[in-house]
Amino acid sequence: IPVIEPSVPELVVKPGATVTLRCVGNGSVEWDGPPSPHWTLYSDGSSSILSTNNATFQNTGTYRCTEPGDPLGGSAAIHLYVKDPARPWNVLAQEVVVFEDQDALLPCLLTDPVLEAGVSLVRVRGRPLMRHTNYSFSPWHGFTIHRAKFIQSQDYQCSALMGGRKVMSISIRLKVQKVIPGPPALTLVPAELVRIRGEAAQIVCSASSVDVNFDVFLQHNNTKLAIPQQSDFHNNRYQKVLTLNLDQVDFQHAGNYSCVASNVQGKHSTSMFFRVVESAYLNLSSEQNLIQEVTVGEGLNLKVMVEAYPGLQGFNWTYLGPFSDHQPEPKLANATTKDTYRHTFTLSLPRLKPSEAGRYSFLARNPGGWRALTFELTLRYPPEVSVIWTFINGSGTLLCAASGYPQPNVTWLQCSGHTDRCDEAQVLQVWDDPYPEVLSQEPFHKVTVQSLLTVETLEHNQTYECRAHNSVGSGSWAFIPISAGAHTHPPDEFLFTP
């Protein structure tokens, strides 16, 4: 890093002072400072001397010495104040150009650091700064307007308080240029349009930019449309709007419409599709199967997609039976709009009860008529089992009734000892009944089956168990013969609560 002699960060000198600044480095060194008169520069090898025999206020500034060959790019600096009571300001530039949201440095350098406490920034002719102008001051560099705005493009003066009066610098013109971040921003409304032949339609294409220099046009199937343009300026943006009004649409108006805007940064375009139909339409569909099976106690959401034009005049969910005459609670019905012509309607059925199985219908109406979509909801139940001892045709028979949905399968077990449930170690015999007799099988109800086990002689120290299972679960009933007759044991798990 080069070294400046004298080795102080800043100095205050009199006008007319002789100033010699010497910079020494390992290699060749270079001076950089404000453009000002009277300086002479001479170098010898690794040192460079900046000298004046008659310093003026214009020599006020920061003098930086760099070593071009230094890979670390180190530098040293000294700030010189030439304290001139008649000239409190040294203005290094009378025009400053920045882009919006950059910091704008107005380079009026104070010639006497003592004056720092009384400095201010004003607009020319003593006008105050615009509201929300956020600025700071450095005696070495001047005033910085932070995050400059286009509207702050003004002529400014730096003011210093000297002996009770304000002394102004020459004016500095600030030009804040709008940043054009890219092509203009676009909106094309509506994003989709459907009309019946003969109806009116409107398509609006608008573009905006921070700069006025941009073009916008609307095209239909690659044909540019001649539409008068409306221009406006608000929120610090220029806007250009093209409005296509169609009094009576016909099929030739249908197709793709593109809104295109361009400036020096490039081009943006956005498209929409206009559909012209002969008459009103209303289509109902669902991504779900219309036949639903759900385990009792669980929940289900039924969803219907609606495509319609014109908009719906009415819609509702209806329970068509077969159990109670209850209707779905409105709070469980929900409607969401995907876009202008497509909607999703959801019916939430939480913790389903046996009486809620059946048909659910979504009905919708628009000028095109009524449409309905019906779901069939069947509830699944684990089997419930009961066993009785009876005589059929004079033969002793164990009769097992199992009821559930889907239809239960039945298995008989004979095991040693008296038990509520046969375990593997106790099992003596197993009989599967592949075709139990179906006693009842109505839609939306449980299926009840019956299985018969003919037993010639009941073994008294044994247990006969009927087991039923389906995809939901299983149930069983243990039959224990006793000398005085038969005794049955339903297991604990039979006590099922949905």
């Epitope: 004298p6 800043e10 009199k14 002072a17």
Partner: antibody, heavy 125, light 106 residues
């Protein structure tokens, strides 16, 4: 408007250390050199020494062994200590701001554009 | 040390007079000389620096000249406010002052 004000005891015993402080008001102490100058009764002005805001100092060779100067930028003041005083150190002591007229690699020199009112220090037992 | 010698030590003059004070340096000090005015009970006031440059706010009746070892302060037309003691000061090598010249009313 920058003003300087000297403060310190008006009476110091021989062989003791004279301590004075100069307070700067109306502006920052930064960027300048600050000097102490004295004038014994019936004699001329004598420059004692100077200090820059960074703390670097230059002293009058004839007083160098006895002089210590310091600066406190946070309090905006600078100080003088003169040790082993004798009756010959009896004088009016001024603090002054120096503004440079010559700046060179090896030295800087200037004139005193702002002075304090001065404070009388008597060395006596 | 560079010695500074002022002459005369005392100067009697009347309002309107042209007054000249001389200052000699024991060795060459180029143009590194200043002149101060001091009134009783007040701090010295800078008049001229770099031998001939008038300090801001100082009346133009004051002027300075010289280089090397011989320097002069001239008051072209003495005013009542000018009766005071004047000091020269060199800043070529450290800082030394002349012993002062008192300008009094004749």
């Amino acid at each position: 408007q920058v003003q300087l004000q000297e403060s310190g005891p008006g009476l110091v015993k021989p062989s003791e250390t004279l301590s004075l402080t100069c307070t700067v008001t109306g502006g920052s102490i930064s960027s300048y050199y600050w000097s102490w100058i004295r004038q014994p009764a019936g004699k001329g002005l004598e420059w004692i020494g100077r200090i820059y805001t960074s703390g670097s100092t230059n002293y009058n060779p004839s007083l160098k062994s006895r002089v210590t100067m310091s600066v406190d930028t946070s309090k905006n003041h600078f100080s003088l200590k003169l040790s082993s005083v004798t009756a010959a150190d009896t004088a009016v002591y001024y603090c002054a701001r120096e503004i440079l007229v010559v700046v060179a690699a090896t030295r800087t020199g200037g004139v005193f554009d702002i002075w304090g009112q001065g404070t009388m220090v008597t060395v006596s037992s | 040390d560079i010695q500074m010698t002022q002459s005369p030590s005392t100067l009697s003059a009347s309002v309107g007079d042209r007054v000249t004070i001389t200052c000699r340096a024991s060795q060459s000090i180029s143009s590194w000389l200043a002149w101060y005015q001091r009134k009783p009970g007040k701090a010295p006031k800078l008049l001229i620096y770099k031998a001939s440059t008038l300090e801001s706010g100082v009346p133009s009746r004051f002027s300075g000249s010289g280089s090397g070892t011989e320097f002069t302060l001239t008051i072209s037309s003495l005013q009542p406010d000018d009766f005071a003691t004047y000091y020269c000061q060199q800043f070529n090598s450290y800082w030394t002052f002349g012993q002062g010249t008192k300008v009094e009313i004749k």
